[in-house]
């Protein structure tokens, strides 16, 4: 806390400019009017203030706006934003996407800081849902943003926003998150034709159920192995050898290299060996010929 001292004669700041970097902490406190600082906040970013001087400037704004800064000040915080704590940011009411962009720009190229996470949380809660423009902005700055949300939070994403999602935005999503996103993507892309639909839906298929995979197998989609390996194991297991062959097309040969990994390993265990042999890939581990397969889960359901 900086002590209250009178401003020396002739040192009163008329504007926020570079001469202020030569002021000591107490001089900044005494000679810079907080209201002046608030109206000329955009100038701070062009002045090489020290960390300590930034602390003084922040303190002045805190005193002027104890209930939280107005958006007109927030939008021009620049690198002073990085001096804010999550507690400070929780007092703000940020409604403009331009303000959000301006502050994300300050942290561009770096991992999401606690300040940025709090800012985004405040912004999204204020909007009530993750609309397309917001999602566009957030994934542009933080490709992994979508996958940092819980399935509950993802449920508030409207299907229309899915158009903003790029494949790399889903790289770190787990199956629970894809379970929520897949139905939204299916709805969003439902009016597209076969090949275009597959290109768009491909990144979301880690949340697809068996029946949708069966339907895709009838459309000559030629799914690559990387996508296949990300499918839900429980969705892959009921697929027949013929369906997997149609689903993968020319990529079916890649199964051999993945035969020890899920979901391929578990799928092989569920297939008849003579069906696997028809692929000519040398896949081993299927159900030997002559064995009867009982689906106990079906039996339990009937009883």
């Amino acid at each position: 806390e900086v002590e209250k001292t009178a401003c020396p004669s002739g040192k009163k700041a008329r504007e926020i400019d570079e001469s202020l970097i030569f002021y000591k902490k107490w001089e900044l406190e005494a000679c810079v009017d907080a209201a002046l600082l608030a109206t000329q906040m955009d100038r701070v970013n062009a002045i090489p203030f020290t960390y300590e001087q930034l602390d003084v400037l922040k303190h002045k704004l805190d005193e002027l706006y104890p209930q939280g800064y107005p958006e007109s000040v927030i939008q021009h915080l620049g690198y002073l934003f990085l001096k804010m704590s999550p507690e400070d940011i929780r007092k703000w009411n940020v409604t403009s996407l331009e303000t959000l962009k301006a502050l994300l720009e300050v942290n561009k190229g770096h991992e999401m800081s606690p300040q940025v996470a709090t800012l985004i949380d405040r912004f999204v809660k204020g909007r009530g849902q993750l609309d397309k423009d917001t999602l566009d902005t957030l994934t542009a700055f933080y490709p992994g943003y979508l996958c940092s949300l819980s399935p509950e939070e993802l449920s508030s994403v409207p299907p229309s926003s899915i158009w903003a999602v790029r494949p790399q935005d889903l790289d770190t999503c787990d199956p629970r998150q894809l379970d929520v996103l897949y139905p939204k993507a299916r709805l969003a892309f439902q009016n597209m034709n076969g090949s275009e639909y597959f290109v768009k839906i491909q990144s979301f298929l880690g949340g697809a159920p068996t029946e949708d995979l069966k339907a895709l197998s009838q459309q000559n989609v030629s799914m690559d192995l990387a996508t296949f390996m990300k499918l839900r194991t429980d969705a892959v297991l009921p697929l027949t050898v013929a369906e997997v062959q149609k689903l993968l097309g020319p990529h079916v040969e890649g199964l051999k290299a993945e035969e020890r990994h899920r979901p391929v390993r578990d799928w092989i265990l569920r297939q008849r060996q003579d069906d696997l042999d028809t692929l000519g890939l040398g896949l081993q581990g299927g159900i030997p010929n002559g064995y009867l397969v009982l689906d106990l889960s079906m039996q339990e359901a009937l009883s």
Partner: antibody, heavy 119, light 107 residues
Framework: QVQLVESGGGVVQPGRSLRLSCAAS????????MNWVRQAPGKGLEWVAV????????YYADSVKGRFTISRDNSKNTLYLQMNSLRAEDTAVYYC????????????WGQGTLVTVSS | DIQMTQSPSTLSASVGDRVTITCRAS??????LAWYQQKPGKAPKLLIY???SLESGVPSRFSGSGSGTEFTLTISNLQPDDFATFYC?????????FGQGTKVEIK
């Protein structure tokens, strides 16, 4: 006068960890930002990481993100660099250097400590 | 990240020469550029900051200019003590990046 003295360097095997320290004196340590910069043998300078005066913000070069952690103890006037999952390409002289603000250059440097990653 | 490109990588000169080193940024960095001098086995030393401001104690034969993406370091009257490697560095973003260096050697 400002003095920065690095320590903790040495020979370490790939995949192992090492912690470097930088003892600061001659200025108000808690007021200034601190950086680590490295220089591989016969190569140029590579900025590694920065930590703000109060430890509130830390930034890293892409080459060390997720493996190295910068930290400071203002009560001990000491800067640290925790280096995990070390690789041969991390072999370098590591310097600590001071900056006074986000838009300030590195005005004081230590003499460096050599880290050699080799099996 | 912002890339910094220095040229030339090596420069041969004689005592008394005027030498110029160029540094180019991959995007505008306003005037947030520093120049450092490093001698073998020693730590780098700050010469110029904010593109053209001379660090205290640095001889006036060193000067810097430029803004945006193009910057130059000039040594007006090369002295025996000036043979070293020079680096530019941007500090407009929190990832501070260096140029690859320019070695000034005796012709």
């Amino acid at each position: 006068q400002v003095q920065l003295v690095e320590s903790g360097g040495g020979v370490v095997q790939p995949g192992r960890s090492l912690r470097l320290s930088c003892a600061a004196s001659g200025f108000t340590f808690s007021s200034d930002g601190m950086n680590w910069v490295r220089q591989a043998p016969g190569k140029g300078l590579e900025w590694v990481a920065v930590i703000w005066n109060d430890g509130s913000n830390k930034y890293y070069a892409d080459s060390v993100k997720g493996r190295f952690t910068i930290s400071r103890d203002n009560s001990k006037n000491t800067l640290y660099l925790q280096m995990n999952s070390l690789r041969a390409e991390d072999t370098a002289v590591y310097y600590c250097a001071r900056d006074r603000g986000p838009l300030w250059p590195l005005d004081y440097w230590g003499q460096g400590t050599l880290v050699t990653v080799s099996s | 990240d912002i890339q910094m490109t220095q040229s030339p990588s090596t420069l041969s000169a004689s005592v008394g020469d005027r030498v110029t080193i160029t540094c180019r940024a991959s995007q505008s960095i306003s005037r947030w550029l520093a120049w450092y001098q490093q001698k073998p086995g020693k730590a780098p030393k700050l010469l110029i900051y904010k593109a053209s401001s001379l660090e205290s104690g640095v001889p006036s034969r060193f000067s810097g200019s430029g803004s945006g993406t193009e910057f130059t370091l000039t040594i007006s009257n090369l002295q025996p003590d000036d043979f070293a490697t020079f680096y530019c560095q941007q500090y407009t973003s929190y990832s501070r990046t260096f140029g690859q260096g320019t070695k000034v050697e005796i012709k």
